[in-house]
């Protein structure tokens, strides 16, 4: 089993504040009560859970930092999605901060890739076509457009 098999739902179906756990687990958008008898809804915009769980608390929503824009808000089943502002990118080696993209390529190099929220501009040597050694490779986008539906605890 991998987490890949256990995708969160895009939008929670309307549910009551409390419901019963299934095999000791609560669905996305909920956490389990301390006595283990109830599933309690997360608070919209405050906390969330993306998977079936037995958490005693939902997870706190991320707040986008200055220098980031909010792509999608926190729901009860999905954390906030933040993205670096235009002209900046998040480096894989230091994902906590957005860094300014370079404005141009060094002499003798030509730009072959634009600044994106996930990568700096990409420069290659004019003759050889090899990447500049200081180049940060593009990071695969982790935001997914169609996450599918959650696995039930007995799947």
């Amino acid at each position: 089993i991998t987490q890949q098999d256990l995708a969160p739902q895009q939008r929670a179906a309307p549910q009551q504040k409390r419901s019963s756990p299934s095999e000791g687990l609560c669905p996305p958008g909920h956490h389990i009560s301390e006595d283990g008898r109830d599933c309690i809804s997360c608070k919209y915009g405050q906390d969330y859970s993306t998977h079936w769980n037995d958490l005693l608390f939902c997870l706190r929503c991320t707040r986008c930092d200055s220098g980031e824009v909010e792509l999608s808000p926190c729901t009860t089943t999905r954390n906030t999605v933040c993205q670096c502002e235009e002209g900046t990118f998040r480096e894989e080696d230091s994902p906590e901060m957005c860094r300014k993209c370079r404005t141009g390529c060094p002499r003798g190099m030509v730009k072959v890739g634009d600044c994106t929220p996930w990568s700096d501009i990409e420069c290659v040597h004019k003759e050889s076509g090899t990447k500049h050694s200081g180049e940060v490779p593009a990071v695969e986008e982790t935001v997914t457009s169609s996450p599918g539906t959650p696995a039930s605890p007995c799947s």
Epitope: I1, T2, Q3, Q4, L6, A7, P8, P21, E23, G24, L25, I32, E34, D35, G36, R37, S49, T50, H51, W52, N53, D54, L55, L59, T62, R78, N79, V81, T142, V143, T144, P147, P153, C154
Partner: antibody, heavy 121, light 111 residues
């Protein structure tokens, strides 16, 4: 306060068997995943087995699959690990843990003090 | 199996100074905005204790000088101001897939 107390460890010969027990208190035992984690002397941690709240879903790593059996008795708030065909490399402190579930068995929220199993002739 | 490699193996830091421990996974442990990486502290003669779950969530009762960060394959546990009681071995653990695996541990000592 959550308390997990292991028992049943001891010295056993290679090829032998041993049954470990864990008595749980301070938590609704029948609501939670439980697990065993071991630590060989002076070494790191290794997950050994996990079981869901009603015993219907069980997980093992390949290193112990077919030799170890995890089980639980919710009426007694107890977790068990039956270990057969023991080898020298199974020598370790065995910890009973409350395993948080988040999409998968996830992180070990509470730990017992451990019980030492020594496999030697 | 996902292999977790911790660095350094041991670390000596002065009291009040920052300690940084790294954990690298052999493949990404991220999905849907969650990083399935967790951190534990084990003091001599004691069982491990959960510090951080899902990369950056501080377990209840853990001092806020401990923090976790990182995503995909690279994760960091930081002790912002080392205290004498922080002398221990620290382990990372992933739950992206079965089997659950731990890093080899990093021993933190006082310089």
């Amino acid at each position: 306060e959550v308390q997990l107390v292991e028992s049943g460890g001891g010295l056993v010969q290679p090829g032998g068997s041993l049954r470990l027990s864990c008595a749980a208190s301070g938590l609704p035992f029948n609501s939670y995943y439980m697990s065993w984690v071991r630590q060989a002397p002076g070494k790191g941690l290794e997950w050994v087995a996990a079981i869901n709240s009603n015993g219907g879903r069980i997980h093992y790593p390949d290193t112990v699959k077919g030799r170890f059996t995890i089980s639980r008795d919710n009426a007694k708030n107890s977790l068990y690990l039956q270990m057969n065909s023991l080898r020298a490399e199974d020598t370790a402190v065995y910890y009973c843990t409350r395993l948080t579930y988040y999409g998968n068995p996830a992180w070990f929220a509470y730990w017992g003090q451990g019980t030492l199993v020594t496999v030697s002739s | 199996n996902i292999v977790l490699t911790q660095s350094p193996d041991s670390l000596a830091v002065s009291l009040g100074e920052r300690a940084t421990i790294n954990c690298r996974a052999s493949e990404s442990v991220d999905i849907y905005g969650n990083s399935f990486m967790h951190w534990y502290q084990q003091k001599p003669g004691q069982p491990p204790k959960l510090l951080i779950y899902l990369s950056s969530n501080l377990e209840s009762g853990v001092p806020d000088r401990f923090s976790g960060s990182g995503s995909r394959t690279d994760f960091t546990l930081t002790i912002s101001s080392l205290q004498a009681e922080d002398v221990a071995v620290y382990y990372c653990q992933q739950s992206y897939e079965d089997p659950l695996t731990f890093g080899g541990g990093t021993k933190v000592e006082i310089k």
